[in-house]
């Protein structure tokens, strides 16, 4: 009878053990072990047992011990089971980020691993257990589908394998994978709504102002503001899911013409982007042209009106004939004309409003002077002693110089307050002298006596 | 469709004068800034002068400043380039580009026209 | 300075996908636009603004950019997409309206 010990082992891969094979017999004519194993006969005294060390054990294997004895031939076999654990564990690699609301697939690899009925495969969120079965397959895979939430943002998902050979007098081989964080994110399915103008004047500054609401996390989110293909550096502020991006923009003479505004918000691996068109224009005043912004009186003024070449023009109220960006009108100039304001209104229709500009110039038209009847009357009879104020008006552009004298020395003080006396009595010669010429015109002053009863 | 189609090319000694012309169509001539941009035998592109849409501004690049002319007439949907005092290195193919905007990238090429300066 | 940088040169195996890279100044305060010329042929716009493509242009084109650097990728080159690649954009200095780089030659094996 044979007989072997130990008859059952557990061992680590690669690992050896000493096995004993022994037979009833004193003297067996033959013992021994049939193994492919590396093995080594230590000696001892006796015939009837012998041990071996069989090494490097990668696999279960099962030695048979042998024995031929006068009665007969018999075996006996020990079992070897090899334990190690899994070569490889990990998640199956998923984008880091994941919106919320969408079933999130996790599956986990398990490479190797013995003996598997011992193997358990445990997905976690961080301690939490998601789902553990036993390895099958090789590799093992398992698999779970999570709904993602928004308070899974920043949790760690994780694969473990569990080696249970505490049953076997061992303990309980953990083996974990590599940590996946999930990073939920809410990008609502609305487009950032972005304000600015829809008009801007070449040499001026716009505001714009790109905001979305029901955003998680807020503070993660990319605004990419944009006016052509200028990048705008906004200020953002952050309320608890909004954002509100804020830039300035000023253009120049090189964006005139149609740019696209675009608001571009990245979260995860998604992004919402708002187009706008924004039109910059050019659109200096009108101009004014006199043909002399002064000329004397009876002159022909031709005023002429020009404007950007789309525009409308009315000049003093009057549009262009044809309508366009050109008008004129002729005038003899005449001293109603002196002061006389030319306005041009220029409009300019850009993506579909109305800009208006206006220029004004003033007309100085040089005549006179003028003395007449109305502003300095020939004819003034005045009380002795009573307080007059002499009035005599020249007329004129420029003003006339006036100087009214009797007998070529006296003068009559216009303007000023006097006490009439027989010597103001008279005919004074009133002369009023400009750059455009003179004119004379008498004057008398009559004094009247007082009456005594 | 939009097509921009160069003319006015050909042969000239150095110091004389040419003069290109861009014909447009399919697309809002006025409305659009329009650029010469010019490439010489085996070489890379290199942007020339620009113009706004109305015609109230024009750019030049400094190699060609005070010797060419960009206008442009809106009534007839043409661009022009006139070419002065020209240059061996300005022997080039010469493509008229269009943009939304002056400063804008190039939305519609012509095919181009060849100028050769040369004795 | 006012000057795009651009390798002369690069290939790309047929289906493969190959970057072309574009450096400047002008990068920092504007996007590039990329025109592919092929042989005997007017440039054509392939990408403009942060990453958009004009209708026509397959969706294989896409543009990025970084700092400044503005770069072109070609996912799954054809045999068609075998020509000079130009970035090009806004001066910043000044000197210019736009500026173009030196452009890239792709070979496509």
């Known amino acids: 009878q044979t007989s072997v010990s130990p008859s059952k082992v557990i061992l680590p891969r690669g690992g050896s053990v000493l096995v004993t094979c022994s037979t009833s017999c004193d003297q067996p004519k033959l013992l021994g072990i049939e193994t492919p194993l590396p093995k080594k006969e230590l000696l001892l005294p006796g015939n009837n047992r012998k041990v071996y060390e069989l090494s490097n054990v990668q696999e279960d294997s099962q030695p048979m011990c042998y024995s031929n004895c006068p009665d007969g031939q018999s075996t006996a076999k020990t079992f070897l089971t090899v334990y190690w654990t899994p070569e490889r564990v990990e998640l199956a690699p998923l984008p880091s980020w994941q919106p919320v609301g969408k079933n999130l697939t996790l599956r986990c690899q398990v490479e190797g691993g013995a003996p598997r009925a011992n193997l358990t495969v445990v997905l976690l969120r961080g301690e939490k257990e998601l789902k553990r079965e036993p390895a099958v397959g090789e590799p093992a895979e398992v698999t779970t589908t999570v709904l993602v939430r928004r308070d899974h943002h920043g949790a760690n998902f994780s694969c473990r394998t569990e080696l249970d050979l505490r049953p076997q007098g061992l303990e309980l081989f953990e083996n974990t994978s590599a940590p996946y964080q999930l990073q939920t994110f809410v990008l609502p399915a609305t487009p950032p709504q972005l304000v600015s103008p829809r008009v801007l004047e070449v040499d001026t500054q716009g505001t714009v102002v790109c905001s979305l609401d029901g955003l998680f996390p807020v503070s993660e989110a990319q605004v990419h503001l944009a006016l052509g293909d200028q990048r705008l550096n906004p200020t953002v502020t952050y309320g608890n899911d909004s954002f509100s991006a804020k830039a300035s923009v000023s253009v120049t003479a090189e964006d005139e013409g149609t740019q696209r505004l675009t608001c571009a918000v990245i979260l995860g691996n998604q992004s919402q982007e708002t187009l706008q068109t924004v039109t910059i224009y050019s659109f200096p005043a009108p101009n004014v042209i006199l043909t002399k912004p002064e000329v004397s009186e009876g002159t022909e003024v031709t005023v002429k009106c020009e404007a950007h070449p789309r525009a409308k023009v009315t000049l003093n109220g009057v549009p262009a004939q044809p309508l366009g960006p050109r008008a004129q009108l002729l005038l003899k100039a005449t001293p109603e004309d002196n002061g006389r304001s030319f306005s041009c209104s220029a409009t300019l229709e850009v993506a579909g409003q109305l800009i208006h500009k206006n220029q004004t110039r003033e007309l100085r038209v040089l005549y006179g002077p003028r003395l007449d009847e109305r502003d300095c009357p020939g004819n003034w009879t005045w009380p002795e002693n009573s307080q007059q104020t002499p009035m005599c008006q020249a007329w004129g552009n420029p003003l006339p110089e006036l100087k009214c004298l009797k007998d070529g020395t006296f003068p009559l003080p216009i303007g000023e307050s006097v006490t009439v006396t027989r010597d103001l009595e008279g005919t004074y010669l009133c002369r009023a002298r400009s750059t455009q010429g003179e004119v004379t015109r008498k004057v008398t002053v009559n004094v009247l006596s007082p009456r005594y009863e | 469709q939009v097509q921009l189609v160069e003319s006015g090319g050909g042969l000239v000694q150095p110091g004389g004068s040419l003069r290109l012309s861009c014909a447009a169509s399919?697309?809002?001539?006025?409305?659009?800034?329009m650029s010469w941009v010019r490439q010489a035998p085996g070489k890379g592109l290199e942007w020339v002068s620009a113009i706004s849409g109305s015609g109230g501004s024009t750019y030049y690049a400094d190699s060609v400043k005070g010797r060419f002319t960009i206008s442009r007439d809106n009534s007839k949907n043409t661009l022009y380039l006139q070419m002065s005092s020209l240059r061996a290195e300005d022997t080039a193919f010469y493509y008229c580009?269009?943009?939304?905007?002056?400063?804008?990238?190039?939305?519609?090429w012509g095919h181009g026209t060849l100028v050769t300066v040369s004795s | 300075s006012s000057e795009l940088t651009q390798d002369p040169a690069v290939s790309v195996a047929l289906g493969q996908t190959v970057k072309i890279t574009c450096q400047g100044d002008s990068l920092r305060t504007y996007y590039a636009s990329w025109y592919q010329q092929r042989p005997g042929q007017a440039p054509v716009l392939v990408i403009y603004?942060?990453?958009s493509r004009p209708s026509g242009i397959p969706d294989r084109f896409s543009g990025s950019s970084s700092g400044n650097t503005a770069s072109l990728t070609i996912t799954g080159a054809q045999a068609e997409d075998e020509a000079d690649y130009y970035c090009?954009?806004?001066?910043?200095?000044?000197?210019?309206?736009?500026?173009f780089g030196g452009g890239t030659k792709v070979t496509v094996l």
């Open positions: 580009a269009n943009s939304a905007y002056t400063g804008g990238w190039y939305d519609y």
């Open positions: 603004g942060e990453n």
């Open positions: 399919g697309f809002t001539f006025s409305s659009y800034a």
């Open positions: 090009n954009s806004r001066d910043s200095s000044g000197n210019h309206l736009r500026v």
